[in-house]
């Protein structure tokens, strides 16, 4: 779809005289009709194949036509047209005397025709005018024109259709070759995918508009690389989604078991030694001279019984010292490796000693694992799920959440691109390894059939008498252009003059 | 035990300003979201606003988007939100959760009520 | 925003009975689906997470069920403690988003 657009610019008649020598009177009113056609070798008679227009008178003998597109459009003259532009035209421009104001073809005597130019070529749609200048014996007309396409409308033809958005269905303008161009932020075949912020992590990130990064559920953080821990997990971190391995001095499913009360609580007083034996438990050290379940208990040295675990005190000028039993060391014989006979393993494990008791290891029942049976195997640790789907822990078993596009128990099959039905017009979708291609239906063409192709009227051959056919591209109908001695709309009557024109 | 004690409610006018804040205890504060969730009076629940753990990443409702800002001090263990220009719809109980907004609320505080009336 | 829809709004029964309350997105929202307990005057209470995991602590009773856009809370024999207001939670969209509660009152 676009517009013919001729710009009359100037005309000359400086005698003031019709075709046929005779003067006007008082002057010739002139005004022009304009018919715009296929190409033609020799322009002839026959249909105004791609419109006509018509001026109201615009001056007297001689006169310059002002540019009056702002004001009611008249100049230049606009001749749309609803098909491919084929390239070429022929152009019929003729200058008549109005004696009166009806201006139509039946008003006026034959004999007002002033004078006649008939052009034909080739001319690419463009932005730029062409100047041309046609000269008779009495006249000069002066005039450019030029082909563009109408709103929306794009390419060497005018036949892409392209109209900007920035909505739900794309965010894009149109480039000069109906190309669409997706508005920053955007990408896709049709710049409906935003562009995440740089850097969100392509599996478990995910946005809506441009240049965010929302975390799907199990992670967090500015590109979502952070996992959250377990919803119950009091004193752990995660390196994936709801584990909760334990800090530091804590055990147990939730890492919520103390095995560190020494460091969190500081029971011991009188800075006495503490030691950890077992879950929220400890033992106090105490210098010598103290003495209390924390230490806070003044005493004299060997009398505090200073030495733990059994450990016998001698009394030394500068204080005291202990011997310790077997397994036990330290200024206090305070210090031991912890053994079976302080319960370590967690969650039903069973503990062995080793070493003559000195160490102990840890067997520990299905699910668990661990040096003190503390942390619950995660089933999704080997990461079963392909293509970035998403392992999820079910009760005795496992899932997987598949990413758009994937599709089976480990997301390991590749969802048709043809599921979705994306060729238009009845076109047949076939799967290729990097997408789909579609097979279009007669008449439709374009990625996904989505352009309609005028049906050729030509082909069956309609015109006779060696006629040149050409399609009417904006009703799927042909025009038969008649060889010099026939006439018809194929050209099958033969004649010996050709007709006037019939407007 | 997981405590969380929310505190810096009360009545103020509309344009006005607000801070509240939650003392965390009895978890890991460093390691995990926090969020705030409001409940206007006899209304349902409301999520706010959320801020990761390590790198303090933040998210909004629209509603409040400009006007609101949380934070959090990991070394005092406390989550903060500033509440600028207070409209009278922010009329509500506002409830300090440990979460994010792609996971559920396993914890929250008892609520501090904030009223914005003239 | 994703809608939850929670029905009924109300609910009486005795205790002993075996009570359900559903909730319905509306889009898909997979499992990502959370049930909450809130008693007068107090702070709602995680119960279930991931459409059927129990929270710590919560009693066996209670359950969920459903995928997609489909939910069910469950309590198979009411106790007089479970009186009280009911609230589902979706959070596999932003913003997350709350049912608006289902009231379970003494018959």
């Known amino acids: 779809s676009g517009v013919f657009q001729l710009q009359l610019q100037e005309f000359i008649n400086e005698r003031g005289v019709l075709a046929s020598g005779r003067p006007c009177e008082p002057g010739c009113r002139t005004f022009f009709r304009v018919c715009l056609k296929h190409f033609q070798a020799v322009v002839s008679p026959g249909p105004c194949t791609f419109g006509t227009v018509s001026t109201p008178v615009l001056g007297t003998n001689s006169f310059a036509v002002r540019d009056d597109s702002s004001g009611g459009g008249r100049n230049p003259l606009q001749l749309p047209f609803n098909f491919t532009w084929p390239g070429t035209f022929s152009l019929i421009i003729e200058a008549w005397h109005a004696p009166g104001d009806d201006l139509r073809p039946e008003a006026l005597p034959p004999d007002a025709l002033i004078s006649k130019i008939a052009i034909q070529g080739s001319l690419a749609v463009g932005q730029n005018w062409l100047l041309d200048e046609q000269t008779s014996t009495l006249t000069r007309l002066r005039y450019s024109y030029r082909v563009i396409c109408s709103d929306n409308y794009y390419g060497d033809n005018c036949s892409r259709l392209c109209k900007k958005r920035n909505d739900h269905f794309g965010h894009y303008v149109c480039q000069p070759d109906g190309n669409l161009s997706c508005l920053p932020g955007w990408t896709g075949e049709y710049c409906q995918q935003p562009i995440c912020l740089s850097g969100c992590h392509e599996q478990n990130g995910y946005c809506s508009k441009p240049a965010e990064c929302l975390c799907r559920p199990g992670w967090q953080g500015r590109l979502c690389n952070e996992c959250i821990p377990h919803n119950g997990c009091r004193h752990g971190t995660c390196s994936t989604p709801w584990q909760c391995t334990c800090d530091e001095g804590w055990g147990g499913l939730f890492c919520d078991q103390d095995l560190n009360y020494c460091t969190h609580h500081s029971p011991c007083k009188n800075g006495a030694t503490c030691s950890n034996s077992g879950q929220r438990s400890y033992t106090c050290t105490c210098r010598p001279g103290y003495t209390g379940v924390d230490c806070e208990l003044e005493l004299s040295e060997c009398d505090s019984n200073p030495c733990r675990n059994g450990g016998s005190c001698k009394d030394q000028e500068d204080g005291y010292h202990c011997l310790c039993p077997p397994g036990y060391y330290g200024l206090h014989c305070e210090h031991s490796t912890l053994s079976c006979a302080d319960s370590p393993c967690f969650n039903g494990g069973s503990c062995r000693e080793r070493n003559q008791g000195a160490n102990y290891a840890c067997e520990c029942p299905p699910n668990f694992t661990g040096s003190n049976c503390e942390k619950k195997v995660d089933r999704c640790t080997s990461n079963p799920c392909a293509n970035g789907g998403q392992c999820l822990n079910r009760g005795p078993s496992r899932m997987c959440r598949c990413r758009p596009g994937f599709t089976g128990t480990y997301c390991e099959l590749h969802v048709s691109d043809c599921a979705r039905n994306p060729c238009a017009h009845g076109g047949t979708c076939h799967d290729l390894e990097n997408g789909l291609m579609c097979t279009c239906p007669a008449g439709f063409s374009g990625r996904r059939c989505e352009v309609r192709t005028s049906i050729d009227a030509c082909a069956s051959s309609p015109c006779f008498n060696r006629a040149t056919c050409y399609t009417d591209l904006s009703t799927d109908t042909f025009v038969c252009n008649c060889p010099y001695g026939f006439v018809g709309s194929r050209c099958e009557f033969p004649v010996g003059l050709p007709p006037s024109f019939p407007w | 035990e997981v405590q969380l004690v929310e505190s810096g409610g009360g009545l103020v006018q509309p344009g006005g300003s607000l801070r509240l804040s939650c003392a965390a205890s009895g978890f890991t504060f460093s390691n995990f979201p926090m969020a705030w969730v409001r409940q206007a009076p006899g209304k349902g629940l409301e999520w706010v606003a959320t801020?990761?753990?390590?790198?303090?990443?933040?998210y909004y409702r629209d509603s409040v988007k400009g006007r609101f800002t949380i934070s959090r001090d990991n070394a005092k263990n406390s989550l903060y939100l500033q509440m600028n220009s207070l409209r009278a719809e922010d009329t509500a109980v506002y409830y300090c959760a440990r979460g994010y907004y792609n996971s559920p609320f396993a914890y929250w505080g008892q609520g501090t009520l904030v009223t914005v009336s003239s | 925003d994703i809608q939850m829809t929670q029905s009924p709004s109300s609910l009486s029964a005795s205790v002993g009975d075996r009570v359900t309350i559903t909730c319905r997105a509306s889009?898909?929202?997979?499992?990502?689906l959370a049930w909450y307990q809130q008693k007068p005057g107090k702070s709602p209470k995680l119960l279930i997470f991931d459409t059927n995991d129990l929270a710590d602590g919560v009693p066996s009773r209670f359950s969920g069920s459903g995928s997609g856009t489909d939910f069910t809370l469950t309590i198979s024999s009411l106790q007089p403690e479970d009186f009280a207001t009911y609230y589902c939670?979706?959070?596999?969209?932003?913003?997350?988003?709350f049912g608006q509660g289902t009231k379970l009152e003494i018959k």
């Open positions: 939670q979706q959070y596999d969209y932003v913003p997350p988003t």
């Open positions: 889009q898909d929202i997979y499992i990502n």
């Open positions: 801020i990761s753990s390590s790198d303090g990443t933040t």
